[in-house]
């Protein structure tokens, strides 16, 4: 004989568990329906009536199948140094991330506690390591034969153009200037950019200790304070 399909609420067989999207109600001692995401339990089940679900009110949500008496409150509005990357709906909480050009300097539990602007490397310095969601840009001096003439959190040092005849030699912050005859090889116009970090939520991971050339921070200096650092600037 085919097994009968039990409709909630029903008493489970001894030693068995309730089915998917059902829960065992201790008071009624029955398997009862859970409420779907976006809803909550308005009335709990009894031996004769199933769970009564109701939609979450504005600014509240449930993300999972549940039997909670009240929906969870969405988080506060995003701080002014953050942007809302996921709105508060009946089925999901609001998510705030650091605004473009910023990174999360301090993560706590679900989100970012403190956003900070990405360091900008000043002329003569280029990006050695791009910023990520949780780490700042690292600047480095442009090596001989390369330059950066911008104040930027994305531009790297790029090679000087090679001239048939040099009018003004290049330095760390300026490209070479050729005489009116065209250069043998010229770099493409415009600065070379590193991609900005994609703004999605991520776990706070500890970056590999690497000395920074920035004036605002460096990390793990067992011999004491660093010599004066250069190469970056504020906004």
């Amino acid at each position: 004989l085919p097994a009968q399909v039990a409709f909630t609420p029903y008493a489970p067989e001894p030693g068995s568990t309730c089915r998917l999207r059902e829960y065992y109600d201790q008071t009624a001692q029955m398997c009862c329906s859970k409420c779907s995401p976006g809803q909550h339990a308005k009335v709990f089940c009894t031996k004769t009536s199933d769970t009564v679900c109701d939609s979450c009110e504005d600014s509240t949500y449930t993300q999972l199948w549940n039997w909670v008496p009240e929906c969870l409150s969405c988080g506060s509005r995003c701080s002014s140094d953050q942007v809302e990357t996921q709105a508060c709906t009946r089925e999901q909480n609001r998510i705030c991330t650091c605004r473009p050009g910023w990174y999360c300097a301090l993560s706590k539990q679900e989100g970012c506690r403190l956003c900070a602007p990405l360091r900008k490397c000043r002329p003569g310095f280029g990006v050695a390591r791009p910023g990520t969601e949780t780490s700042d840009v690292v600047c480095k001096p442009c090596a001989p034969g390369t330059f950066s003439n911008t104040t930027s959190s994305t531009d790297i040092c790029r090679p000087h153009q090679i001239c048939n005849v040099v009018a003004i030699p290049g330095n760390a912050s300026m490209d070479a200037v050729c005489t009116s005859t065209s250069p043998t090889r010229s770099m493409a116009p415009g600065a070379v950019h590193l991609p900005q970090p994609v703004s999605t939520r991520s776990q706070h991971t500890q970056p590999t200790p690497e000395p920074s050339t920035a004036p605002s921070t460096s990390f793990l200096l067992p011999m004491g304070p660093s010599p004066p650092a250069e190469g970056s600037t504020g906004d």
Partner: antibody
Framework: QVQLVQSGAEVKKPGASVTVSCKAS????????IIWVRQAPGQGLEWMGW????????NSAQKLQDRVTMTTDTSTSTAYMELRSLRSDDTAVYYC?????????WGQGTLVTVSS | DIVMTQTPLSSPVTLGQPASISCRSS???????????LSWLQQRPGQPPRLLIY???SRFSGVPDRFSGSGAGTDFTLKISRVEAEDVGVYYC?????????FGRGTKLEIK
């Protein structure tokens, strides 16, 4: 008990650099940030910057950004603040304090005098 | 930057009487995590600052219960129910909701 002990007073000439140290004890150094605050004679408190002792992430006041370097040495539970190109208006008592959500323990302060 | 405006800048009070200091921020101090990172510091003459109140109304350990903090959003108050001689000094409100952290200009509490 939690303590932050700072280095001693300094007298510097304009254009020089100064490094103030802040040795922490009584807690796990890497689980808190350190802020640096200064107070010019007879003036209020001025926030200079914050550094994470966990990963070195930091942020400093925009007006000081080109002149200040904050570092941490987790092996000795010490934070450092270096201020370069000193000017007479940098004369102040410099404080370190623990925290980011709130600043619960403070160093005793380090007087830096900039005078020619 | 968030500007913290304290009033009054000076407050002469009688011993045993209450005192109240107001602090207003130029924008809401409510963080997206739901917390409001507003603290009150006391600085006695010749001493470093000392934490009194954090997250608007939580009293730090060892702080007498005559100190209380209240407020929300952009308006905050520090109250001393009965001023004692040892309360003389400058009181600062400070926000650490976002960078740059900022302080009020301070309120000098003195005895009449």
């Amino acid at each position: 008990q939690v303590q932050l002990v700072q280095s001693g007073a300094e007298v510097k000439k304009p254009g020089a650099s100064v490094t103030v140290s802040c040795k922490a004890s009584g807690y796990t150094f890497s689980t808190y940030g350190i802020i640096w605050v200064r107070q010019a004679p007879g003036q209020g408190l001025e926030w200079m910057g914050w550094i994470s002792a966990f990963n070195g992430n930091a942020n400093s006041a925009q007006k000081l950004q080109d002149r200040v370097t904050m570092t941490t040495d987790t092996s000795t539970s010490t934070a450092y603040m270096e201020l370069r190109s000193l000017r007479s208006d940098d004369t102040a008592v410099y404080y370190c304090a623990r925290g980011e959500d709130f600043f619960d323990y403070w160093g005793q302060g380090t007087l830096v005098t900039v005078s020619s | 930057d968030i500007v913290m405006t304290q009033t009054p800048l000076s407050s002469p009070v009688t011993l045993g009487q209450p005192a109240s200091i107001s602090c207003r921020s130029s924008q809401s101090l409510v963080h997206s995590d739901g917390n409001t990172y507003l603290s009150w510091l006391q600085q006695r003459p010749g001493q470093p600052p000392r934490l009194l109140i954090y997250k608007v109304s939580s009293r730090f350990s060892g702080v007498p219960d005559r100190f209380s903090g209240s407020g929300a959003g952009t308006d905050f108050t520090l109250k001393i129910s009965r001023v004692e001689a040892e309360d003389v000094g400058v009181y600062y409100c400070t926000q650490s909701t976002q960078f740059p952290f900022t302080f009020g200009r301070g309120t000098k509490l003195e005895i009449k």
